[in-house]
């Protein structure tokens, strides 16, 4: 009876999400394997988040708008492990917007989800950020490693979206 009511709840939750995400990929989690954590197909999952690499070229504002249409934000990178996971799926000759910007050019960097900007957990390329006119951050591959660079926000780039996993 308990299992039946849990399944019914799950199905109604799935139907609820169906209107936003036509397809979800779910895995069983938790100590009793009773919880399901899901990401929209074809998003990838890492820890408690889902990631989507957008290959359409857009300005930073439009990229953030595009992520929000999908219920996400431009990616906020919190750890080196997270960055290493994300970069496995990136093309080395491309650049991708992050959810990091310096709106006034005062070198006050801020994440789109209001996560505090911690200078000790940043992955800027050597010599970056280097211009107060370049107020948006990208991740790209240079000098044999992935790192961040400040760029002009209005020049179109690819982007990475991130959202919390859906638990059902």
């Amino acid at each position: 009876n308990f299992m039946y009511s849990k399944t019914v709840k799950r199905l109604s939750k799935l139907q609820e999400y169906q209107q936003y995400y036509p397809s979800l990929t779910c895995v069983m989690e938790g100590k009793d394997m009773e919880d399901w954590s899901c990401c929209p197909t074809p998003w990838t999952s890492f820890q408690s988040s889902c990631y989507f690499i957008s290959t359409v070229m857009q300005s930073w504002t439009k990229s953030q708008n595009n992520c929000s249409v999908m219920g996400a934000d431009l990616v906020v990178i919190n750890t080196k492990e997270e960055q290493d996971f994300i970069t496995q799926n990136l093309k080395i000759n491309s650049a991708y917007f992050l959810g990091l910007s310096d709106p006034k050019g005062w070198r006050h960097w801020q994440w789109v989800d209001q996560t505090p900007y911690n200078k000790n957990v940043t992955f800027w390329h050597s010599g970056e950020p280097n211009s107060p006119d370049e107020r948006c951050a990208i991740i790209n591959f240079r000098s044999e490693e992935w790192g961040w660079n400040d760029v002009h926000c209005h020049v179109p780039q690819k982007s990475i979206c991130k959202m919390k996993k859906i638990y059902i």
Partner: antibody, heavy 120, light 107 residues
Framework: DVQLQESGPGLVKPSQSLSLTCSVT?????????WNWVRQFPGNQLECMGY???????NYNPSLKNRISITRDTSKNQFFLKLNSVTTEDTATYYC?????????????WGQGTLVTVSA | DIQMTQSPASLSASVGETVTITCRAS??????LAWYQQKQGKSPQLLVY???TLVDGVPSRFSGSGSGTEYSLKINSLQPEDFGIYFC?????????FGGGTKLEIR
Amino acid sequence: DVQLQESGPGLVKPSQSLSLTCSVTGYSITSAYYWNWVRQFPGNQLECMGYITYDGSNNYNPSLKNRISITRDTSKNQFFLKLNSVTTEDTATYYCVRGGDYDDGGFAYWGQGTLVTVSA
Amino acid sequence: DIQMTQSPASLSASVGETVTITCRASGNIHNYLAWYQQKQGKSPQLLVYNAKTLVDGVPSRFSGSGSGTEYSLKINSLQPEDFGIYFCQHFWIIPYTFGGGTKLEIR
């Protein structure tokens, strides 16, 4: 104020390459923005061909990808269009245009255009 | 690519009249739409960006509206200098494509 000026041959033979130059005054092409080539066919239809960004990266319209190259000479503040294997279908007025104004919401600065006819 | 369908292809009107030109996108372009005016032998001139914001110096008789996939440019009280070709262009994802143009002629 920023000004853009196209130059190049007005007549190109089929199967040859079309080469145009855009000279920019009043703004450095390495400072910001992205620098486009847009063409207008005889029936007035406009097409974005591709661009080079202030930091030198390119993006091309997939319909032209194998034939187009956009490069620049930063010392002369110029950028260039090369279109290979042209046919009569490439007859058009070619414009160089600055991209990225109004947070990338519209093309505010255009050259005056140069007519290129492809004919034997 | 997002396709832009503009209508009508041509339009005859008299000075003082009001006209409306429409543009339909093949997908949601989230208000990232620009309108241009082009006079004979000249390059296009930006009139409106973000669907409804007029560029400085553009007369207030021009107005843009719309959302999603449907947009329009309205010109109130047509003036002799308003005649020419009008184009829409989306600015949502690269490549930014143009409508086919609307030729506005004096009746």
